[in-house]
Amino acid sequence: SERCDDWGLDTMRQIQVFEDEPARIKCPLFEHFLKFNYSTAHSAGLTLIWYWTRQDRDLEEPINFRLPENRISKEKDVLWFRPTLLNDTGNYTCMLRNTTYCSKVAFPLEVVQKDSCFNSPMKLPVHKLYIEYGIQRITCPNVDGYFPSSVKPTITWYMGCYKIQNFNNVIPEGMNLSFLIAFISNNGNYTCVVTYPENGRTFHLTRTLTVKVVGSPKNAVPPVIHSPNDHVVYEKEPGEELLIPCTVYFSFLMDSRNEVWWTIDGKKPDDIPIDVTINESISHSRTEDETRTQILSIKKVTSEDLKRSYVCHARSAKGEVAKAATVKQKVPAPRYTVELACGFGAT
């Protein structure tokens, strides 16, 4: 056969679907690899061919589109399962070709089982809700294209294992779930089960997402440097270890990059000819506010090092702040035999 542009196995698209539920999978060629869509390809005389490799097998096989009740079918650039079975798991390939052109890509499809509380190995999308905010909504994801707009499905929402009915702060509104108030107690998994009829059969779509309640943008502040501060003086003798922590609190901000760094005499530590190490630790509050600590360490400090300026800097989407540490050379305590004796005029 003639050469085919093989995009390999697209592991970026780790498609997971539930057993015994409908699944519609678009050929990734048109979404990620080619600059034209299926309609253009079809009108240019290109044909889309599907085949697969079963789990733990090397043999590529054609997909059987002659199963009872059209359990597996193809419609334009979509491969349909009505419904899936556990042994549909494998690598699927879609190939676009005619006599002069060929392009193909493979992707893994995993059919997973769920228990009665919707627990499964499925990787769940995370939806962040703000604490101390107005009404917020989550929407039942990835249900477009399964049924026409003329079909009115029934949607049932669950919080973990509990059917959401007459909840004090959460109201199901069709495909949306409205949170009148988002409490930290609302953290967890929410599932919508969409039930719809098709050709005399009833299908269920189960979609679970994780809700994480985070700090409100209304309460967000620029970074706050807790240490160094004006109350602590780092007084050292030459030869001792100098340890200065820079501890910074960052309000949660969606998609904000939080940064902490030290400068020594206005330069980055790497650009100063001293043996300095910096260790960072990060902790998060229940609402994903962040505390970063960077400890600047000089194992054996010199009198020159004790004259330098050590400044902690922090930056987030809310602003940039800096604070200098107060570093001093410790005045050695006088030794009686020499210093005091001299002071008393002894010779």
């Epitope: 009404i135 909840f167 004090n168 409490f183 107690s185």
Partner: antibody, heavy 119, light 107 residues
Amino acid sequence: EVQLVESGGGLVQPGGSLRLSCAASGGTIGGSAVHWVRQAPGKGLVWVSRILTYSSTTQYAESVKGRFTISRDNAKNTLYLQMNSLRAEDTAVYYCARGSSEYPKFDIWGQGTLVTVSS
Amino acid sequence: DIQMTQSPSTLSASVGDRVTITCRASQSISSWLAWYQQKPGKAPKLLIYDASSLESGVPSRFSGSGSGTEFTLTISSLQPEDFATYYCHQLLIYPHTFGQGTKVEIK
């Protein structure tokens, strides 16, 4: 520390009206909601109504729906419960309580105001 | 409405005793339960929220446990100031409902 102080209670005839106030001192009420809870003499606690802080959404117990109205005046940092068509069974100490914004809990309570409905 | 049933209704105990109060919900409320203490003529005071979290400033002799429909409030060593009435409160389902109360009195 925010404190809640109720006022407006008293003796009223059946069918009459009263307006209870719940004023916050020491800061804004804050929280996720403010609730009214009542306690008939010698009885337990019964939830009456709530108003959400961020959306002004209101909810009522079935026993008071259509008769009681909860509202607030942000400028005065005060919550109100307008009680109409009062009945003998509405006799109780009325407490306002703040619903926390972090967890479902009523973390601050007022000292209560007594409403007596009697002819 | 969800029924919250507390037991016992009255409990006689002595200072130093370990006291346990049970609260049962008529349907599952996850961990959306709070416990309050009320003394005569006073407003209720929050002790426990989220079924097992101790409210700030509340002595550590108070603890809560449970999830779903069965919950307990435990006072590990009863103190003179603990003689009061205790209420459980479910906050998951509309409307909020309270237990009928458990009066802890001196034996």
